[in-house]
């Protein structure tokens, strides 16, 4: 079995986690992709997913999570804006490929969000904060609910760096509410 590895990000409340998941262009360009959280002893939970088929460079927002799938680059970009302490946890990108199990994109992300002032005088993160000023148009997300049992057995033991959060504490918008937003370049 391939050894699972983690990449750790320690960020402050209010900051943005901005990561990219690399995938094989020929196989997965139009496949539906998802961002999941993995909690100890539980199945990975899908927080947001792209459309099916996944559209190129077409941002999808679910609460504070923004997904953009760049087919021409073979990259799924995931942003979690306005981070809260409760967002701390272990995350992963997966590709849905029914009827087969979801394909996990390496590496997993260990996010640790701490309280405290994130910026320096004059710092500016408007490019992501502007997200909240956009009038939303919503559609129903069709995120598959199945999760690979194999993925669960691979879930690593809880890291000492992990800030544990009860299930009810991660307050993300209902996954069925998808908001289209313009690209922030």
């Amino acid at each position: 079995a391939t050894k699972l590895t983690e990449e750790k990000y320690e960020l402050k409340e209010g900051q943005t986690l901005d990561v990219k998941c690399d995938y094989t262009l020929e196989k997965f360009a139009s496949s539906q992709k998802a961002w999941q959280i993995i909690r100890d002893g539980e199945m990975p939970k899908t927080l947001a997913c792209t459309e099916r088929p996944s559209k190129n460079s077409h941002p999808v927002q679910v609460g504070r999570i923004i997904l953009e799938d760049y087919h021409d680059h073979g990259l799924l970009r995931v942003r979690m804006v306005n981070l809260q302490v409760e967002d701390s946890g272990l995350y992963q990108c997966v590709i849905y490929q029914p009827p087969k199990e979801p394909h996990m994109l390496f590496d997993r992300i260990r996010l640790v969000v701490t309280k405290g002032f994130s910026g320096t005088p004059g710092s500016n993160e408007n490019s992501t904060q502007n997200v909240y000023k956009i009038p939303p148009t919503t559609t129903k997300a069709l995120c598959p609910l199945y999760t690979s049992p194999r993925t669960v057995t691979q879930a690593p033991p809880k890291s000492t760096a992990d800030v544990s959060t009860p299930d009810s504490e991660i307050n993300l918008t209902n996954v069925t509410d998808i908001i289209r937003v313009p690209v922030f370049n």
Epitope: T2, T5, E7, Y9, E10, L11, K12, Q15, T16, L17, D18, V19, K20, C21, D22, Y23, T24, L25, D72, H73, G74, L75, R79, L105, F106, D107, I109, S118, N124, E125, N126, S127, T128, N185
Partner: antibody
């Protein structure tokens, strides 16, 4: 232990060619993006080129576009940089660097190989 | 292309003192910023990424802060091995990835 070892540097005349290699060990090479970064004598760092792991997408700095080609052989755990039409300003130490899976930041570097372009 | 500007070019500090290095991006890069240390004759070494996360094995005296366009690397109490050149790098969006011109931290 992660290791990156560059080779192929040397002296070449303007207009000439060189092929740099970077042999890696200690991680699953095919999974990670790799970059070449150079440093002219006494100067700062300049990113040159990147090749993604899974997608195989390639990117180049404007200063080398059309002259340099990045490639990789996952079966040999080796990254390459083919440099053609070399110019005096390409003189530098060339480093290969492993990237994070999740972002283009460089967590492991080789010791570099010196390329000197001079007539 | 995102231009990264570091200041000062040279910082003269006594051992045991605090050093504060600045890096400014020409446009917002969110938290997509890394800091590297380079000593003469050596390859760069990753210190900080995501603006504030210490890389594996980096001592706690190194800390990063900032977001958007303004970033700071702080070395709380300079040790002899910390005298080196420090570079910031943005990894926002897509290539080209750009570095600052470097700040040399020298012994006062």
């Amino acid at each position: 232990e992660v290791q990156l070892l560059e080779s192929g540097g040397g002296m070449v005349q303007p207009g000439g060619s060189l092929r740099l290699s970077c042999a890696v060990s200690g991680f699953t090479f095919s999974r990670y993006a790799m970059s070449w970064v150079r440093q002219a004598p006494g100067k700062g760092l300049e990113w040159v080129s990147e090749m993604r792991g899974s997608s195989g997408s390639t990117y180049y700095a404007d200063s080398v576009k059309g002259r340099f080609t990045i490639s990789r052989d996952n079966s040999k755990n080796t990254l390459y940089l083919q440099m053609n039409s070399l110019r005096v300003e390409d003189t530098a130490i060339y480093y290969c660097a492993k990237e994070f899976s999740s972002n283009s930041l460089f967590d492991y570097w080789g010791q570099g190989t010196l390329v000197t372009v001079s007539s | 292309e995102i231009v990264m500007t570091q200041s000062p070019a040279t910082l003269s500090v006594s051992p045991g003192e605090r050093a504060t290095l600045s890096c400014r991006a020409s446009q917002s890069v969110n938290s997509n910023l890394a800091w590297y240390q380079q000593k003469p004759g050596q390859a760069p070494r990753l210190l900080i990424y995501g603006a504030s996360t210490r890389a594996t094995g980096i001592p706690a005296r190194f800390s990063g802060s900032g977001s958007g366009t303004e970033f700071t690397l702080t070395i709380s109490s300079l040790q002899s091995e910390d005298f080196a050149v420090y570079y910031c790098q943005q990894f926002y969006n897509f290539p080209p990835w750009t570095f600052g011109q470097g700040t040399k931290v020298e012994i006062k």
